[in-house]
Interface confidence: medium
């Protein structure tokens, strides 16, 4: 049977186990697998692979008993290892491979493990002594039985029959995406000092998540995907978000080399040597990565993460996964592959992608030659120096190449004619007897941000003509007003004559025509992403992002935009959130982004608000975003009552305890006050951050954010012995803005 | 009208004792965790112990600085909180007040007695 | 411990105008945060709660901000009975403890 690490098998022991007769046959790559366990209260017998040792635990009543396998033999080598684990007349041996690796005298009382056994992992099982335990198996149980029953019936959908071929797959290997919700995940991905990770990417999805790790602050994130064909990658770091787009197509089912490296000052990624990055300005800072890195899907936590950004990443790109596959997989130069994944689902080892799917387009000759953008830029100087052969006349001698280029310059948005200037021959045409229309020009590979448009009839579908085209001005580049201040064009040249000439220019010369584009400055505008209608509830405030409006403007970062509220400053309702009570009339659109801007309602009819953005050359036009403040209304949605065991503690969760307002994408405070005194326990409320190990302590009040944390419970503290069930009654108030609800 | 009125205080010798009361007023005493907070030119406000009710166990916390030299204790009966000092240091002089956690969010202080002033000198 | 940094220990203001104050937390103590006013030869009296909470009788002209780390009072329309010195505490975990204070004076 397969694990792929995080399944797990239950089996039920509905007796104490006297006798135990345990048998596994396992292999794994990984160092740290939890085998089995059998799960009581407090008795438990744990068997796990630690630093690719075999460790057991035996808990009976008060006595402990450990054994493990020697230091030298480490068990995490793929290979299959069989373990025979006995419990007989207060006798523990533990074998290995058929060696006797330790034995022990053991407490004669039966193991009472009323929970069950758990095999491969402990599922959602949350006891005191599974602390620190082992990850979940990642390899294979080829066997395992208990006093001869086995442990491996019945499967559940999870855990694969046989042994899955990617648990030995090499380096290389390619991962494949089977999808619909496939995913890899990796140890943490440490962007410390800097950060790569690159791999080869064959898929025709459009939109897929290809990698993500989360930051150990929350909410920050580095986020790689394809949106709408092409590669992104978001940073999220601090309250602010870096993101970038490259722009050459990837889903087309061919491969592409992919690479995305970050550090302190910039963010790059790089498709087939094509590269787009952040400028050095932008300071990321170090991301300290938490929990796995994630590889051509998502985890239910990285999805929430990602809806909950202000990024229009909808649930169905996040829920989406991969189809296709990532070969030569790096992380910070160290090679990956699916042995070295924690956890995998839906995968396969290398990359069967349906041949029909991906089956190249077979050109005619003369028909239209691709014009996407570069794909990989031969690493070689273009163009390749011709050698003449031998005997040719003289007008060929030190002949290397056939023109001189120089580079095309273009408006952003305009026009420019390709002239004789920018493509000169190196040569006297006439003294080697070439007419210009015998020199032929084919369109390779287009430029990313326009057309080479051609005025000759036919030519335009080719993406042919002549020298002789160029000097009669038919031949002339459109920009198509995107940003990038560079561009090129892939051209073959070859001459068509029946003269004696080198046979490379028979054959042809690539040249590449550098394209330089001058930009124009566009005046920004304002949008509204979700319209321009905002809804606050009366007395609270609402956070004034890039989810309520936001600058458009393709040629300024977001740090040379300014805003303004126009209209009067006395009781202008946008504040910054460090400076409650003041008026912020202007403000950056990195202030924004950051979220440090929110709408204070402080009664009465609520202001709209008109902007305007600068880039400090232009201002938009005047945008108005329509304010309505509503009457907190308050709905109680759950309130259930717990039931506990005397002395005992239990969390009160949204499931017991919560209510609904009418806000609308406002994150209210909802605030629940005790109104009466408790008589039988206390209250409680656990320290920021809710992490294992903070405090509880008694509280009489305490937030709905609480709850949905898990950071509120019901102690009972009641020492007198009753002898019927006591009922606390527990009264509270409910406040939303200056809105109470009583007697809950 | 919720009122905390504090007794005891005065002048005291290094290594001396002192017991500081505080009886209550206006609201039902027993529901209320008291707690003793001291306020001092050097350190500003300190808080130094705190007692809980019947139903937890009277639990008790102090701050380190006072801790094994300081006793919280209180009398439901009596409606009072009590506050024993012993083996006293210069640093424990300042103005020591007694307060409640009310019915409001978390371990804030709703309710001040009017203070009393311990000073401990030679 | 945690500390709590309070800026600036003294301020000085005119009846009417706005003023705030910062409290800053030694690490994260979520909203868990009061605001005290202490009048002179009085004792504390209670503000804020849970970093933006009024508490019962205060003026509106009293807010509070901040989460995390950061936290602020204001005091917008400040009037002549606002001379006190203006206490921040946390109550995320024990021991409790007190910003320096903040001495507000009247010109």
């Known amino acids: 049977a397969s694990f792929f690490g995080e399944n797990h098998l239950e089996v039920p022991v509905a007796t104490a186990l006297t006798d135990i007769d345990l048998q596994l046959q396992f292999s794994t790559s990984q160092p740290e697998a939890l085998l089995l366990l059998a799960a009581g209260p407090a008795d438990h017998l744990l068997l796990q692979l630690y630093s690719g040792r075999l460790q057991v635990r035996l808990v009976l009543g008060q006595e402990e008993l450990r054994l493990q396998t020697p230091a030298e033999t480490l068990l995490s080598d793929s290979i299959p290892h069989t373990v025979v684990l006995t419990v007989v007349e207060g006798w523990a041996t533990l074998s290995v491979d058929g060696f006797l690796n330790a034995s022990s005298a053991v407490p004669g009382a039966p193991l009472e493990v009323p929970y069950g056994l758990f095999v491969g992992g402990t599922g959602t099982l949350g006891l005191p002594y599974l602390r620190g335990t082992s990850r979940p198996l990642r390899g294979c149980l080829h066997a395992a039985t208990l006093n001869g029953r086995s442990l491996l019936r019945p499967l559940t959908p999870d855990v694969h029959e046989g042994c899955a071929e990617e648990f030995s797959a090499s380096d290389d290997v390619a991962l494949g995406f089977s999808g619909p919700h496939s995913l890899a995940a990796f140890p943490a991905w440490g962007t410390q000092d800097e950060g790569t990770l690159e791999f080869t990417l064959t898929t025709q999805s459009r939109q897929a998540p290809l990698a993500f790790q989360a930051g150990g602050r929350r909410g920050d994130f580095i986020y790689v995907d394809i949106f709408e064909g092409h590669l992104r990658a978001v940073v999220e770091k601090g309250q602010g978000t870096v993101l970038l787009h490259n722009s050459v197509p990837v889903a087309d089912g061919q491969p592409h080399e992919v690479s995305v490296h970050i550090n302190a000052h910039r963010l790059e990624i790089s498709v087939d040597q094509y590269p787009t990055h952040t400028s050095n300005r932008g300071v990321l800072s170090y991301l300290e990565p938490r929990g796995s890195l994630l590889l051509g899907g998502l985890d239910a936590e990285a999805s929430r993460h990602l809806q909950e950004h202000r990024l229009g990443l909808t649930p169905e790109a996040t829920n989406a996964s991969l189809l296709g596959c990532m070969e030569d997989l790096s992380v910070n130069g160290q090679r990956r592959g699916l042995r070295e994944a924690l956890l995998t689902r839906n995968m396969a080892a290398g990359c069967r992608l349906e041949e029909e799917e991906y089956e190249d387009d077979a050109y005619g000759h003369y028909e239209a030659f691709s014009t996407l953008a570069p794909e990989a830029w031969p690493a070689m100087e273009l163009p390749e120096p011709c050698v003449p052969e031998p005997g040719l006349p003289p007008v060929f001698a030190n002949f290397t190449q056939l023109l001189t280029i120089s580079p095309l310059v273009v408006a952003e948005g305009g026009t420019a004619w390709l002239e004789w200037r920018h493509v000169q021959p190196t040569l006297d045409l006439m003294e080697a007897e070439l007419r210009k229309s015998q020199v032929l020009f084919s369109v390779t590979r287009g430029a990313r941000h326009g057309e080479l448009e051609l005025d000759i009839p036919g030519a335009q579908a080719r993406k042919m003509f002549t020298l002789l085209d160029v000097v009669n001005r038919k031949a002339r580049f459109i920009h198509d007003g995107s940003e990038d201040t560079s561009d090129q064009l892939v051209l073959e040249v070859s001459v068509t004559a029946r003269v004696p000439m080198p046979s490379c220019l028979r054959r042809g010369q690539t040249y590449l025509l550098p394209i330089q584009v001058n930009p124009v400055n566009d005046p920004p505008h304002i949008i509204f992403p979700h319209g321009s209608l905002m809804v606050i509830l009366e007395h609270t405030q609402k956070p004034l992002g890039p989810e309520v409006f936001q600058a458009y403007d393709p040629d300024s970062a977001c740090e040379g935009l300014t805003f303004q509220v126009l209209g009067t400053s006395s009781g202008l309702p946008v504040e910054r959130r460090d400076q409650p009570g003041e008026p912020a009339t202007e403000f950056s659109c990195r202030e924004l982004e950051a979220g440090s801007l929110v709408y204070v309602h402080r009664g009465g009819p609520a202001q709209d608000l008109t902007f305007r953005v600068s880039d400090g050359l232009q201002a938009s036009p005047p945008a108005t975003l329509k304010v309505v403040a509503i009457r907190p209304a308050i709905q109680i949605h759950r309130s259930t009552g717990l039931r506990l065991a005397q002395g005992s503690a239990m969390p009160i969760l949204p499931a017991n305890l919560s209510v609904e307002t009418n806000a609308v994408g406002q994150d209210v405070s909802v605030l629940f006050r005790v109104t009466g005194a408790l008589q039988f326990g206390e209250l409680q409320k656990q320290g920021a951050g809710g992490v294992e190990g903070a405090e509880w302590w008694a509280t009489q009040a305490f937030h709905q954010r609480d709850v949905e944390q898990g950071r509120v419970r019901y102690l009972s503290t009641d020492p007198q012995h009753h002898a019927y069930d006591t009922v606390e009654n527990l009264a509270l108030e409910v406040q939303v803005g200056q809105e109470i609800l009583s007697n809950l | 009208q919720v009122k905390l009125q504090q007794s005891g205080g005065g002048l005291v010798q290094p290594g001396g004792s002192m017991k500081l009361s505080c009886v209550v007023s206006?609201?039902?005493?027993?529901?209320?965790?008291m707690n003793w907070v001291r306020q001092s030119p050097e350190k500003g406000l300190e808080w130094i112990a705190e007692?809980?009710?019947?139903?937890?166990?009277?639990?008790?916390y102090y701050a380190e600085s006072v801790k094994g030299r300081f006793t919280i204790s209180r009398d439901d009966s009596k409606s009072s909180a009590y506050l024993q000092m012993i083996n006293l240091r210069a640093e424990d002089t300042g103005i020591y007040y007694c307060?409640?956690?009310?019915?409001?969010?978390?371990?804030?202080?709703?309710?001040w007695g009017q203070g009393t002033t311990v000073t401990v000198s030679s | 411990d945690i500390e709590l940094t309070q800026s600036p220990k003294f301020m000085s203001t005119s009846v009417g105008d706005r003023v705030s104050v910062t409290c800053k937390a030694s690490?994260?103590?979520?909203?868990?945060v009061a605001w005290y006013q202490q009048k002179p030869g009085q004792s504390p009296e209670p503000l804020l709660f849970s970093a933006s909470y009024r508490y019962t009788g205060v003026p509106d002209r009293f807010t509070g901000s901040g989460s995390g780390t950061d936290f602020t009072l204001t005091i917008s329309n400040v009037q002549s009975e606002d001379l006190a010195e203006y206490f921040c505490?946390?109550?995320?975990?024990?021991?409790?403890?007190f910003g320096g204070g903040t001495k507000l004076e009247i010109k």
């Open positions: 505490q946390q109550y995320n975990s024990y021991p409790l403890t």
């Open positions: 007692i809980r009710l019947k139903s937890n166990n009277f639990g008790r």
């Open positions: 307060t409640s956690y009310g019915n409001y969010v978390g371990h804030y202080f709703d309710h």
């Open positions: 206006g609201f039902t005493f027993s529901n209320y965790w």
């Open positions: 690490q994260n103590v979520d909203t868990n």
